[in-house]
Interface confidence: medium
């Protein structure tokens, strides 16, 4: 004889009782009415299950809450099912068995027939687990039911001191959806908040869970698939303050079925977004966007931000959104990189793009910009990286494309290619009035527009000039003169520690900034405009340094321990961290500080020049770093501003030395013997290079490195030319993770030194 193996299967759900109504007392678990009604309803549920073939498996049940409308009972029950039958008793089958019993004409005296008028249509059965019941039970001491009326913004009161875990059971009108808004009000906390697409905390119906006071999303809004949601709050540490504000609304379902016809132009034409963007998309999201293209000369480009698409096996669910484009199934995933999906046009009727949430787990709303591209030449003068759909500079010595194809098959890498015989000459020799190519092709078309390419400068009128680095060189190269605009920059003032450095003189580096908290120098920076200072994002990685209010910026400063007439100080009104900054890889290590009032330029305070995206800083060139950082590894910060010359290092050698951890947004400089380098406290400070015109351009920002001045490990800097588009976007008011917002959490500062 062998005992039958059984498994405990947990079901959760709700039913509506048409002949009863909800009362306020039933919303409070501690009331006599609740205890009485829940006992009776639990008995009714037990009888209902027992009267079907499930009765032999019945173990236990509970009615844990009531809801509005005709009285809604929220329950769970456990069946001990033989192992071999486990898969056959799905929630759908169980619901069918119970509905059949409710609809049957059996002459039973059970309360579900006599006392309670149970609505068979309204029966909901969901799969649950024993752990879900444990979580639910742990919150019952602080269980709050709220009905959310249309148009009402209902604040949810945080738990009191005695409780460590609370559950809000939210319900709204059936034709609306629940939307919860969570706003973190404190910098540091250890609290957890989980939101479920069900009345109770069912793991399989989790929409999202957040831990700690998230600086990435200081405010988040989350949608349920319908009119029910459960929010569980778990306290992480004793506090007299709620670390967040919670409020809830009932909102109408928003349609996202769109038909659009695009115009025959190549700039961005609009965007598609999930309902209630930037709210988290709902677990029931299904969007269908149909875009019609004016001709088959064009393809459609979808531009994503911190989200990308990839092929997925058909038997695997998409966990962050499913996309169907031209019968291709793609899965979305969040990433700290830009991405474009290019859709070649093969039929004139356009393309339909479907976005669906396949599981309850969702994520931040998705917004995608759309534009057309020329199918015959998708990236004029550049290389189309098939991995991410982006146009990247080709043959410039930097592998921008993850597969490195932009640097393959180059006739000339980081050099100019002569037309006559494909000879390569160094870029500074182009348009320098001295022919280097056999027939002088390096000196042709220097006064006229040329097709845009990796090293051509793009004028404001979008035409391009051949001369490398024409910005602010005293000669107007663009027809519209835009290469000589915004040139009040890069000139030293009065004259002309860093490891191995020498002391600077007053006005020598007038763009140098000292970023301080409570009188202590933390990071360097550089003035780039009258209200803007640029620095490294990693300076703000600590929670205690994340708020702009904490920081003071000093300009024109020479010595840390004393003030002198040439220096000025500013508070920070806004802080912008690059949205793709990743603390582990140090990628996109750049931040912008908006000062509380404009800078008045002087001999000791003036901005450095920003390079164009096409600006070429030649490997081997000697440039300068400045800062008050430590003069030896592990040492204290310097009192007097230090300067040191370093040599720019080719990207391939740099990447080799750091075992390929160097991204295209990084630039290396230093010496084989070390000794001259940036160090702790120099983070965010400028790496500047002098152009033949005498102006200084910002090539890099002190970011990270292995130790300081160590042999064979040079300093790694943020490559400004690769983040200049974002910088310009922020400076012109185009956004980029602003406010106190930060994106992620080593560093030179803070020199992110290992």
């Amino acid at each position: 004889y062998k005992a039958e193996v059984t498994v405990s299967q947990v079901y959760s759900g709700s039913l509506r009782v048409l002949n009863r109504h909800f009362s306020q007392d039933l919303g409070r678990r501690e009331s006599i009415a609740f205890r009485s009604e829940s006992a009776k309803a639990q008995k009714m549920l037990q009888e209902l299950v027992a009267s079907t073939r499930l009765g032999t498996y019945y173990n236990s049940s509970s009615v844990y809450s009531f809801g509005e409308g005709p009285l809604t009972c929220f329950f769970w029950f456990i069946l001990d099912i033989p192992e071999y039958q486990r898969l056959t008793l799905s929630p759908e089958v169980v619901r069918e068995l119970l509905v059949d019993e409710l609809l049957s004409n059996s002459s039973t005296l059970a309360s579900y027939k006599t006392e309670y008028e149970v609505d068979p249509e309204g029966l909901v059965i969901l799969e649950a687990s024993v752990n879900d019941i444990v979580v639910l039970n742990s919150t019952l001491g602080c269980y709050r039911y709220s009905y959310v009326n249309p148009g009402q913004v209902l604040p949810l009161k945080g738990p009191d001191q005695q409780t460590t875990s609370c559950l809000w059971h939210l319900q709204g009108p059936e034709d609306l959806m629940i939307k919860v808004r969570l706003e973190w009000t404190r910098v540091d906390c250890r609290d957890r908040v989980a939101m479920y697409d069900a009345a109770g905390p069912l793991e399989k119906r989790l929409i999202t869970s957040v831990y700690g006071c998230s600086r990435q999303e200081p405010v988040m809004e989350v949608l349920a698939s319908g009119s029910v949601m459960a929010v569980v709050w778990k306290k992480g540490m004793h506090s007299y303050y709620d670390p967040f504000l919670l409020s809830v609304k009932s909102v109408a379902f928003q349609d996202c079925q769109v038909n659009l016809t695009l115009e025959g132009r190549l700039d961005t034409q609009g965007f598609l977004r999930t309902p209630y963007y930037p709210s988290y998309y709902s677990p029931s999201t299904h969007c269908s966007w149909h875009l019609t293209v004016p001709s088959l000369d064009y393809g459609l480009a979808l531009w994503f931000d911190a989200y990308a698409l990839r092929r997925q096996k058909y038997n695997r669910l998409c966990t962050q959104g499913q996309w169907m484009i031209q019968n291709r199934r793609l899965c979305g995933f969040r990433t700290l990189q830009p991405y474009a999906e290019r859709i070649p046009m093969v039929a004139s009727d356009g393309v339909t793009i479907n976005f669906t949430s396949q599981i309850s787990l969702t994520g931040p709303g998705v917004q995608v910009y759309y534009s057309l591209y020329n199918q015959s030449d998708p990236c004029p003068g550049e290389f189309l990286c098939s991995v991410n759909g982006l146009c990247v500079p080709a043959c410039d010595g930097i592998k921008d494309c993850p597969n490195g194809l932009d640097e393959r098959n180059c006739v000339c890498r980081a050099m100019f290619q002569c037309q006559e015989d494909s000879t390569c000459i160094s870029l500074p020799r182009v348009c320098d009035r001295q022919p280097d190519c056999l027939n002088g092709s390096d000196e042709e078309q220097c006064q006229e527009g040329v097709p845009c390419g990796t090293f051509t400068f793009q004028c404001e009128d979008r035409s391009c000039v051949k001369k490398p680095n024409p910005e602010c060189d005293g000669q107007s190269d663009c027809r519209d003169g835009s290469d000589e605009q915004h040139c009040d920059c890069g000139l030293q003032g009065l004259s002309s520690r860093i490891v191995g450095g020498t002391v600077s003189s007053e006005g020598e580096w007038p763009w140098q900034a000292s970023l301080q908290i409570r009188g202590r120098h933390i990071c360097g920076g550089a003035l780039i405009a009258d209200r803007w200072v640029i620095t490294a994002a990693h300076c703000f990685q600590e929670d205690s340094m994340a708020s702009p209010k904490l920081w003071t910026v000093f300009l024109g400063k020479m010595r840390q321990n004393s003030r002198w007439p040439g220096e000025v100080s500013f508070k920070v009104s806004r802080l912008f961290l690059h949205p793709y900054h990743e603390e582990d890889s140090h990628d996109y290590d750049v931040a912008l500080l908006q000062l509380d009032h404009p800078v008045v330029y002087s001999a000791t305070v003036r901005p450095v020049c920003l390079p164009a995206r096409s600006h070429f800083f030649e490997p081997g060139q000697h440039c300068w770093i400045t800062g008050w950082g430590a003069q030896r590894e592990g040492g204290p910060v310097s009192n007097t501003l230090q300067k040191v010359d370093v040599q720019l290092v080719p990207q391939d050698l740099c990447s080799e030395a750091y075992r390929y951890q160097v991204s295209p947004r990084m630039l290396c400089a230093g010496y084989r013997k070390g000794k001259k380098d940036a160090c702790q406290g120099d983070s965010g400070g400028p790496l500047v290079c002098r152009e033949p015109s005498g102006r200084w351009f910002l090539a890099g920002l002190v970011s990270w490195g292995l130790g300081c001045g160590r042999p064979n490990f040079f300093g790694v800097y943020t490559r400004v030319t690769r983040v200049i588009n974002w910088i310009q976007q922020v400076l012109t008011g185009g956004g980029g993770s602003g406010g106190g917002g930060s994106h992620h959490h080593h560093h030179h500062g803070s020199h992110h030194h290992h």
Partner: antibody
Framework: EVQLVESGGGLVQPGRSLRLSCAAS????????MYWVRQGPGKGLEWVSG????????GYADAVKGRFTISRDNAKNVLYLQMNSLRPEDTALYYC?????????????????WGQGTTVTVSP | QSALTQPPSASGSPGQSVTISCTGT?????????VSWYQQHPDKAPKVMIY???KRPSGVPDRFSGSKSGNTASLTVSGLQAEDEADYYC??????????FGGGTKLTVLG
Amino acid sequence: EVQLVESGGGLVQPGRSLRLSCAASGFTFDDHVMYWVRQGPGKGLEWVSGISWNSDTIGYADAVKGRFTISRDNAKNVLYLQMNSLRPEDTALYYCAREKDGDFYYNYFVMDVWGQGTTVTVSP
Amino acid sequence: QSALTQPPSASGSPGQSVTISCTGTSSDVGFYNFVSWYQQHPDKAPKVMIYEVSKRPSGVPDRFSGSKSGNTASLTVSGLQAEDEADYYCSSYAGSNKVVFGGGTKLTVLG
């Protein structure tokens, strides 16, 4: 005067070992990457090995990898090449050479000063 | 790593120009801009004439110039003189701390 003087060459049987030395003078030895380059009788130049100024980066040609070891003593201004399991095809004039511009971080992989070479003959 | 390919010989009359080619792969000459050229007279040590594709060390006459196109580098000697008769070798960095030389080209000055 900048000078490199090789020594230690000679006639040796296959399978045996030999150690070459290169004495440097007239420049700051530990500022420079150093190389060994060989030239077989009537043949062209063949790069053998290179070593960074502080010995933490070393490279070998595939033909000698696992048999030859490059090293340096910065205190004595001497570069060494330990050659084990010698083969007849290792017969050559062995030059010691220094890397140009030792001051810079990265190598140009350029040999701007050469010694006169020392001859190694591997024969039964 | 395989040797770079050079023509075994090249020649020219005094005053003429001559170009010597050096062909590698996309992993050496084609990838890095670290191409050097050496001159070697009989029974003498080599002397560097060009480095980083086209840079000339001080003391090297400007008659010597270097260039590169794709996987091929070239050394051009213009205004050929009798003392230019020698063997010429190219070299390139090949990644992973390795350097590779060409097989060498014997340059003959005619007449």
